[in-house]
């Protein structure tokens, strides 16, 4: 007695989509046999505009396959993301974005320099677009540092006015009494810690103006304060030792020839800070006629020796130890020419010689009760004392 | 069995950011396919955002392409939707959403009420 | 791509034999899904690639169409279909229909 199997219908061949090939190849496909679809590199499996990792189809007993063949389609990375203050150029052709074509990523000539790579990046066959390092994200196009219109580091108080594009860096911080600041990258500013203290738990109150030359103009960009961090060695109103603090800005600021970032100083900067090198201050403190200056002023100064500082304010009414290893010390033994009350939290500002950009070595902080006293000299954060600490800000915030 | 589970805040204020996460359960988000979102309006029209692919490659609607941002975090089998600038006409359900034919199938999360109110 | 389904309502009895059109304003091969969803649920898949049923879905549920012009038919309505349904293509992004609602005579 034999019973008559119907031998279940043969699914319909399949056919390989295009740049696609099909395993396991078999003369035929009967009821539960199977089989994948691979893609060439630089193509992707696509059910329309969906995406696969992998298919699989499988023969039903009705002679059909369980699902519709796939696409391989040519990988798309899909528009590159834009780049602040820089532009993409499609190198393969007009809008070209799929597998293998390749982009050009720039930055705005003279203020900004691109960070991380060459800036050319290929559509990879993992959908992405990736740098000849192998890095997803786009660069970064980093503001250009320590440019000024000054070119000179020759010849506030006992100080000349400042021209437009000299101190691209300055920054007017109001909210509390007058103080100054120095911008850095593009979204943070230098300052003394003791010019903001009061405000460092409400830093939203800080009034913050760049690219200003009078401190009165009304021509300026305003900025405003994200957060404030003040040093955690700085102690107030018990010496001015870290003396310095870092504001975070609520926007990043567009870099132009009147805002420019200040460069941090490098590991050889101290070659450039030595006895007698030059500094320049700049702010809108106290002048010689005891009034805050309407127009921005500079002065340059000499550095001087830490030794002869340190003796200038062990006597009376100073006491012993004020100036610390975390100070440097500039002015003329004759006075005259210093900064003064106002200009704190601003930077002194030395040439590197090497790089021809200017640097931050000081920042405003504290001086005689009387500004350009004789054998008295402003005393200033030694900001190299401070890398470390201000990039782990920058870094995590 | 694969399971989305939508979370978020109820309410939105006008001009603030939108933020989503659908939590996956029984299946790894990089295994495969498109985990995407689709909003409904009051008066039951559905809107496709977006999705990020098993690879982490992002679509988006072009409609709404300047302003949305879809992420994951691969350890905790989590997809994201940010939506910046929300105004009122953005009040709808939001799902989360497993797209795909075949063996694929289909998974939806229940949804999650978004009001856009100052 | 607009996904067009014309009629917003449609009424129908138990046991009756019922189409819901869908018409694309372009070319979108079979990439077509169809969903049901009833008040207060997620939406639920039905049909995926124009005419593939999902597993667990009542074979009286069955798609067609290819191109620009599809259709969702209910060949023995049974009370439980009462719901609104959308089609969905995703041959170029991803959009939906705006709905058809069935409901009784």
């Known amino acids: 007695h034999h019973h008559h199997h119907h031998a279940s219908q043969p699914c319909p061949y399949p056919m390989a989509p295009p740049n696609g090939h099909l395993s396991p190849v078999q003369a035929k496909y009967i009821l539960k046999d199977s089989f994948s679809i691979f893609c060439e590199p630089g193509y992707e499996l696509l059910q329309g505009h969906l995406p696969l990792k992998s298919f699989a189809a499988v023969c039903q007993k009705d002679g059909s396959w369980d699902q519709p063949m796939p696409s391989c389609s040519i990988v798309d990375c899909g528009p590159p993301d834009d780049l602040p203050s820089g532009r993409v150029e499609y190198i393969t052709g007009p809008e070209v974005t799929t597998y293998k074509a390749v982009i050009q990523y720039s930055c705005e000539e003279t203020f900004y320099t691109m960070k991380v790579n060459d800036g050319k990046y290929v559509c990879e066959a993992d959908g992405f677009w990736t740098s000849s390092k192998g890095e997803r994200s786009p660069p970064v196009c980093e503001p250009v540092c320590g440019l000024s219109a000054r070119t000179t580091g020759g010849r506030i108080y006992g100080g000349q006015k400042a021209k437009p594009g000299d101190f691209p860096w300055q920054v007017l911080i109001l909210g509390g009494s007058t103080a100054a600041g120095a911008l850095l990258y593009d979204n943070w500013v230098l300052t003394a810690a003791h010019a903001i203290y009061e405000q460092k738990h409400d830093a939203s109150s800080l009034d913050i103006r760049l690219g200003a030359l009078k401190r009165l103009s009304p021509h300026y960009t305003q900025a405003w304060a994200e957060a404030v961090f003040i040093h955690e060695g700085y102690t107030h109103d018990a010496g001015f030792d870290n003396d310095i603090a870092l504001i975070k800005l609520n926007n990043k600021v567009v870099i132009n020839s009147n805002i420019t970032p200040i460069c941090l100083p490098r590991k050889e900067a101290e070659s450039f800070m030595r006895t007698d090198d030059i500094g320049t201050a700049s702010g809108w403190g106290l002048t010689q006629r005891g009034l805050l200056a309407r127009n921005l002023m500079y002065v340059d100064i000499p550095i001087v020796d830490h030794q002869k500082c340190t003796a200038a304010y062990e006597k009376p009414p100073y006491s012993g130890g004020s100036v610390t290893a975390n100070m440097l010390c500039a002015g003329l033994e004759s006075g005259g020419k210093d900064s003064c009350r106002g200009d704190a939290g601003g930077a002194l500002v030395f040439l590197d010689n090497e790089t021809q950009r200017w640097f931050v070595g000081g920042i405003v902080s504290w001086g005689s009760m009387n500004c350009g006293e004789a054998g008295q000299y402003g005393v200033y954060t030694k900001v190299i004392n401070y890398i470390p600490w201000i990039k782990n800000i920058i870094s995590n915030f | 069995d694969v399971q989305l589970q939508e979370s978020g805040p109820g309410l939105v204020k006008p001009s603030q950011s939108l933020s989503l996460t659908c939590t996956v359960t029984?299946?790894?988000?990089?295994?495969?396919?498109?985990w995407n979102w689709i909003r409904q309006f009051p008066g039951n029209k559905l809107e496709w955002m977006g999705y990020?692919?098993?690879?982490?490659?992002?679509s988006y609607n072009p409609s709404l392409k300047s302003r949305i941002s879809i992420t994951r975090d691969t350890s905790k089998n989590q997809f994201f939707l940010q939506l910046n600038s929300v105004t009122t006409e953005d009040t709808a359900t939001y799902y989360c959403?497993?797209?795909?034919?075949?063996?694929?199938?289909?998974?939806w999360g229940q949804g999650t009420s978004v009001t856009v109110s100052s | 791509i607009v996904m067009t389904q014309s009629q917003k309502f449609m009424s129908t009895s138990v046991g009756d034999r019922v189409s819901v059109t869908c018409k694309a304003s372009?070319?979108?091969?079979?990439?077509v899904a169809w969903y049901q969803q009833k008040p207060g649920q997620s939406p639920k898949a039905l049909i995926y690639?124009?005419?593939y049923r999902y597993s667990g879905v009542p074979d009286r549920f069955t798609g067609s169409g290819s191109g620009t012009d599809f259709t969702l038919t209910i060949s023995n309505v049974q009370s439980e279909d009462l719901a609104e349904y959308f089609c969905?293509?995703?041959?170029?992004?991803?959009?939906f229909g705006s709905g058809t609602k069935l409901e009784l005579k």
């Open positions: 690639s124009a005419s």
């Open positions: 959403a497993k797209l795909g034919g075949g063996h694929g199938m289909d998974y």
């Open positions: 372009q070319n979108v091969d079979t990439n």
């Open positions: 969905l293509q995703y041959n170029s992004y991803l959009t």
């Open positions: 990020i692919s098993y690879s982490g490659r992002t």
């Open positions: 029984g299946y790894s988000i990089t295994s495969d396919y498109a």
